[in-house]
């Protein structure tokens, strides 16, 4: 698994809906896989993790100003939708087959 | 200033070119803000940090399962250009007006 | 080597419109920005826009909004200036010179009488 | 706008002279600051560019100075062919704007 040491990657999560308390609304699927971001974003910041010009030089200025400056940080980038069947405002079953930004599709250095 | 203990926020990160030794070739300007998102992203998570909903299930499994899970992070999820005179492959001086994704526009919880 | 020549003098009447040429050679035309520049008689420099020779988008002066219309052919590696409406206030000599302006064409005057 | 004044609007000067010239910009500019020379019926000719750097081809007695809102041209011993018109330029703003220019001429 993806520890501190390790370069930013996407790892599993699954995520129980009881555990967060959103089986009060959430009835299927019980849990999903959300995917986690975890790693470090160290120099150099590779072509995977897509990096942005700021993320390049904030990571150049950590390298320079450790204590002053934070790396990049290890972060979804792309999410994909999961299909949920939900209770809605009225109580009424509904299936959604997109329910947007659930699950991590790619990580990235932000 | 924004330290770990409080919320995610845009602070001021100047960035001077030599330090970072891209001097080489960016002849103008010499240093910039750059900003950096910084602070952590607690429960609850503030509209001001956009949250995207794999970040609001991600902080909730931290709040249950601190050691296994991260929070989410604070990073820009708003870029903003800067005007540049870089040196091309040629070696000719050369105003870019948008130098995209230089500085923070807007920080948010990822 | 890198050249910029511009389009031969013009005499225009007043609300008439021109349109000034300026051919690139001696480097890829789309590589860089390309400017335009006036100068009255006797008088100092005044930037009037620029153009983005890739997409062809373009920024200009405000004093110029809506008189002033600069585009390019790719093709021959020209831009072009035109200034519409014109005045006597408009005789002066127009500059093209590239994005860092350290290329200039050798200029083009323009006389607007009647 | 952002305007550039120069000082002085014209100088005279003989050869060997050490000569500078002022620009000031009405915000702060870093260092988008170029210089121009300029001879009757010609085009302008860049000197300098990002507030210092000598443009390929120009004499080093030219050299250029400051950041921010105040800027120098200083030519370290003038020559003959120096007289001429010097135009400093802001490219700062996307609203690119040039000094009113100051003569040099002969004392």
């Known amino acids: 698994s993806a520890g501190a040491g390790s370069h930013c990657q996407k790892t599993s999560l699954r995520v129980n809906f009881e555990d967060i308390g959103w089986d009060s609304w959430i009835i299927a699927p019980k849990e999903y896989e959300a995917y986690e971001c975890k790693g470090g974003c160290f120099f150099p910041l590779a072509d995977d993790v897509t990096p942005t010009k700021h993320a390049i030089v904030q990571t150049l200025v950590h390298l320079k100003f450790p204590t002053k400056v934070g790396k990049a940080c290890c972060v979804p980038t792309k999410l994909s939708p999961i299909s949920v069947l939900y209770k809605d405002d009225m109580g009424v079953p509904t299936l959604k087959y997109h329910y947007e930004g659930m699950s991590v599709a790619e990580c990235g250095c932000r | 200033s924004a330290g770990a203990g409080s919320h995610c926020q845009k602070t001021s990160l100047r960035v001077n070119f030599e330090d970072i030794g891209w001097d080489s070739w960016i002849i103008a300007p010499k240093e910039y803000e750059a900003y950096e998102c910084k602070g952590g992203c607690f429960f609850p998570l503030a509209d001001d940090v956009t949250p995207t909903k794999h970040a609001i299930v991600q902080t909730l499994v931290h709040l249950k399962f601190p050691t296994k899970v991260g929070k989410a992070c604070c990073v820009p999820t708003k870029l903003s250009p800067i005007s540049v005179l870089y040196k091309d492959d040629m070696g000719v001086p050369t105003l870019k007006y948008h130098y995209e994704g230089m500085s923070v526009a807007e920080c948010g919880c990822r | 080597q890198v050249q910029l020549v511009q389009s031969g003098a013009e005499v225009k009447k007043p609300g008439a419109s021109v349109k000034v040429s300026c051919k690139a050679s001696g480097y890829t035309f789309t590589s860089y920005y390309m400017n335009w520049v006036r100068q009255a008689p006797g008088q100092g420099l005044e930037w009037m826009g620029w153009?983005?020779?890739?997409?062809?988008?373009?920024n200009y002066a405000q004093k110029f909004q809506g008189r002033v219309t600069m585009t390019r052919d790719t093709s021959i590696s020209t831009a072009y200036m035109e200034l519409s409406r014109l005045r006597s206030e408009d005789t002066a000599v127009y500059y093209c010179?590239?994005?860092?302006?350290?290329?200039w064409g050798q200029g083009t005057l323009v006389t607007v009488s009647s | 706008d952002i305007q550039m004044t120069q000082s002085p609007s014209s100088l005279s000067a003989s050869v060997g002279d050490r000569v500078t010239i002022t620009c000031r910009a009405s915000?702060?500019?870093?260092?988008?600051l170029a210089w121009y020379q300029q001879k009757p019926g010609k085009a302008p000719k860049l000197l300098i560019y990002?507030?210092?750097n000598l443009q390929s081809g120009v004499p080093s007695r030219f050299s250029g100075s400051g950041s921010g809102t105040d800027f120098t041209l200083t030519i370290s011993s003038l020559q003959p062919e120096d007289f001429a018109v010097y135009y400093c330029?802001?490219?700062?703003?996307?609203?690119?704007?040039f000094g009113q220019g100051t003569k040099v001429e002969i004392k």
């Open positions: 330029q802001q490219l700062y703003a996307e609203s690119i704007t």
């Open positions: 153009i983005n020779p890739v997409q062809g988008n373009t």
């Open positions: 915000q702060t500019i870093s260092n988008f």
């Open positions: 990002a507030a210092s």
């Open positions: 010179a590239r994005n860092y302006f350290d290329v």
